[in-house]
């Protein structure tokens, strides 16, 4: 505990001497002196400290607010915060998952390119020529038009990005 200018990475300079930092999961209750080491105390339940520190309070565990669509993904410990995620059918709107939003369905004429995850929304793309999607969906991709020719049928109605082609019997030559 003697005089030193540069303290180690698990120490801090206090009143001209190097004191031990408190380990993760604890907090400072008394700075070191020439006669005593740093005094630390474990974080209370519902609190944490993630790093070596000299703070007199631990941090409160995060509350995953159900009214905001949040639920607990991983319970907090004395050394880590609670991790929140969104309920089924929703995704986080920020990196820290502070709020949730409903997954966006792909509307008719658009297909799902990437399904939504707990951190990303659905990625939709317009159905290209020869493909269609006739419903709002969180998972349906664009489907190819039916090939009337392969069924030995003829096209009665052309397909669009939202509708399939309609096939019918070939009319007989008169």
């Amino acid at each position: 505990l003697g005089q030193c200018v540069t303290c180690s990475d698990k120490q801090y300079l206090h009143d001209g001497q190097c004191c031990d930092l408190c380990q993760p999961g604890s907090r400072l209750t008394s700075h070191c002196t020439a006669l005593e080491k740093t005094q630390c105390h474990p974080c209370d339940s519902g609190e944490f400290s993630a790093q070596w520190n000299r703070e007199i309070r631990c941090h409160q565990h995060r509350h995953c607010e159900p009214n905001q669509g949040l639920r607990v993904k991983k319970e907090g410990t004395a050394e880590s915060d609670t991790v929140c995620t969104c309920k089924e059918g929703q995704h986080c709107t920020s990196k820290d998952c502070e709020a949730c939003a409903q997954h966006t369905p792909c509307i008719p004429g658009f297909g799902v390119m990437e399904m939504a995850t707990e951190t990303t929304d659905t990625v939709c793309h317009p159905c290209p020529v020869g493909f269609f999607s006739n419903q709002s969906s969180l998972f349906e991709k664009c489907y190819p038009w039916t090939s009337c020719e392969d069924k030995n049928l003829e096209v009665l109605q052309k397909g669009t990005s939202q509708t399939n082609v309609i096939c019918g019997l070939k009319s007989r030559m008169r």
Epitope: D15, L28, T29, H41, R54, I56
Partner: antibody, heavy 116, light 106 residues
Framework: EVQVVESDGGLVQPGRSLKLPCAAS????????MAWVRQAPTKGLEWVAS????????YYRDSVKGRFTISRDNAKSTLYLQMDSLRSEDTATYYC?????????WGQGVMVTVSS | DIELTQSPALAVSPGERVTISCRAS??????MHWYQQKPGQQPKLLIY???HLESGVPARFSGSGSGTDFTLTIDPVEADDTATYYC?????????FGGGTKLELK
């Protein structure tokens, strides 16, 4: 010698504001959390607010949250308590103190009277 | 909030041993501290973390206890010890003080 000296107390009307400074000397100011503790006339001690080494973390008792702001200027070794929307129940002697989990040095205190 | 209960007053004769008690409404481990306040003065730290004597404080003062029950002992009491004694917990915020025990000498 460690010293903390509060100033700028006085009589103030309800609803008005007052800012208390506390000048510290004799120790490395930025090495300590600092706090304000008050004592109503003939009453006991009541913790008001605390602030971390660099001012990044602040803590308040519920009755002053949103009305009082604790701050510090480490370059000037000075602690402040900005008191807004003052009430009669804020009448007290206000002490500035060095804070770890206990308060090891206290100023002599400054009287704040909230009355019309 | 954690409430700290102290008996309001004590009267003792110089040279006697006196114990001042403080009871917490919840366990505070050893995060209890004791202060002395003389009339017209600021409080002065005597004991920190239940049993550690603050630098410069006479060895006549000692502290003990953990959990919910704590004691400040003065042995022997001197005339200059006339004051109000406060306990304070730092288990969680708000950091709270006891109501104080006024020590009078007979």
């Amino acid at each position: 010698e460690v010293q903390v000296v509060e100033s700028d107390g006085g009589l103030v009307q309800p609803g008005r504001s007052l800012k208390l400074p506390c000048a510290a000397s004799g120790f490395t100011f930025s090495d300590y959390y600092m706090a304000w503790v008050r004592q109503a006339p003939t009453k006991g001690l009541e913790w008001v607010a605390s602030i971390s080494y660099d001012g990044s973390s602040t803590y308040y008792r519920d009755s002053v949250k949103g009305r009082f702001t604790i701050s510090r200027d480490n370059a000037k070794s000075t602690l402040y308590l900005q008191m807004d929307s003052l009430r009669s129940e804020d009448t007290a002697t206000y002490y500035c103190g060095r804070h770890s989990s206990y308060f090891d040095y206290w100023g002599q205190g400054v009287m704040v009277t909230v009355s019309s | 909030d954690i409430e700290l209960t102290q008996s309001p007053a004590l009267a003792v004769s110089p040279g006697e041993r006196v114990t001042i008690s403080c009871r917490a409404s919840d366990s505070v481990s050893t995060l209890m501290h004791w202060y002395q306040q003389k009339p017209g003065q600021q409080p002065k730290l005597l004991i920190y973390l239940a049993s550690h004597l603050e630098s410069g404080v006479p060895a006549r003062f000692s502290g003990s206890g953990s959990g919910t029950d704590f004691t400040l002992t003065i042995d022997p009491v001197e005339a200059d010890d006339t004051a109000t004694y406060y306990c304070q917990q730092s288990w969680n915020d708000p950091w709270t003080f006891g109501g104080g025990t006024k020590l009078e000498l007979k």
